[in-house]
């Protein structure tokens, strides 16, 4: 950023970082929990059509997997990467891809996978040797 | 190079309107998405509006929502602002500014253009 910049920066609102950038929220996918027909696939995406701006400059994209034995759920939403979610801390928060990683849940399957580019966690991916390829 | 330049900033009384705009060169305009940003005196920067490279999509701090209208003309390689129904606390310094690489990093700046809403 050039030096006319201000570099006072509210950090509830925009941060920056050490070469002048300034971090405006992240745009997610966010439509909380739906029903999902994602099974048994090698990725997904999440046909979630509201796309939000985080809150916070620091928040990013999470999608959270879930099957019982009524039916299959997905959420995404915005995120605190310093905050668990679910009881479970946010990997590969920085991650450009939304990988699903397994999570230990007493009577379901659950999977979650945190990212941080805008609309990230629109294309989830459950096997990582796949992610070059286009959602099934 | 990359450069932004910012132009149509004034003096308009509250519930008047104003159209800012922002010149880009040195990159390929129509492959970044784009914002503006605003510095209030004596405040931080507040981001404003965002616009997708696509110039479809579109976003508001709830601040401007429903008065402020971001677009942009890629064949002109211009990003603009129009701003109506302007209110005292929209007095500001404003902004246009490019994203890095989608991940909502802002790395290049105009010089920025005051707005002033007085009576």
């Known amino acids: 950023i050039p030096p006319h910049v201000p570099k006072s920066v509210n950090s509830d609102v925009m941060a920056s970082d050490n070469g002048g950038a300034v971090k405006l929220p992240q745009l997610c996918k966010f439509c909380d929990v739906r029903l999902s027909t994602c099974d048994n696939q090698k990725s997904c995406m999440s046909n979630c059509s509201i796309t939000a701006i985080c809150e916070k400059p620091h928040e990013v994209c999470v999608a959270v997997w879930r099957k019982n034995d009524k039916n299959i759920t997905l959420e995404t939403v915005c995120h605190d990467p310093k905050l668990t979610y679910h009881g479970f801390t946010l990997e590969d928060a920085a991650s450009p891809k939304c990988v699903m990683k397994e999570k230990k849940r007493a009577g379901e399957t659950f999977f979650m996978c945190a990212c941080n580019m805008e609309e990230c966690n629109d294309y989830i991916i459950f096997s990582e040797e796949y992610t070059t390829s286009s959602p099934d | 190079e990359v450069q932004l330049l910012e132009s149509g900033g004034g003096l308009v009384q509250p519930g008047g309107s104003l159209r800012l705009s922002c010149a880009a060169s040195?990159?390929?305009?129509?492959?970044?998405?784009m914002a503006w940003v605003r510095q209030a005196p004596g405040k931080g920067l507040e981001w404003v509006s965002r616009?997708?490279?696509?110039?479809?999509?579109?976003y508001y701090a709830d601040s401007v929502k429903g008065r402020f209208t971001i677009s942009r003309d890629n064949s002109k390689n211009t990003l603009y602002l129009q701003m109506n129904s302007l209110r005292a606390e929209d007095t500001a310094v404003y902004y246009c500014?490019?994203?890095?690489?989608?991940?909502?990093?802002?790395?290049?700046w105009g010089q920025g253009t005051l707005v002033t809403v007085s009576s």
């Open positions: 500014a490019k994203d890095r690489a989608k991940n909502g990093w802002f790395d290049y």
């Open positions: 040195g990159f390929t305009f129509s492959e970044y998405d």
């Open positions: 616009i997708r490279s696509d110039g479809v999509r579109t």
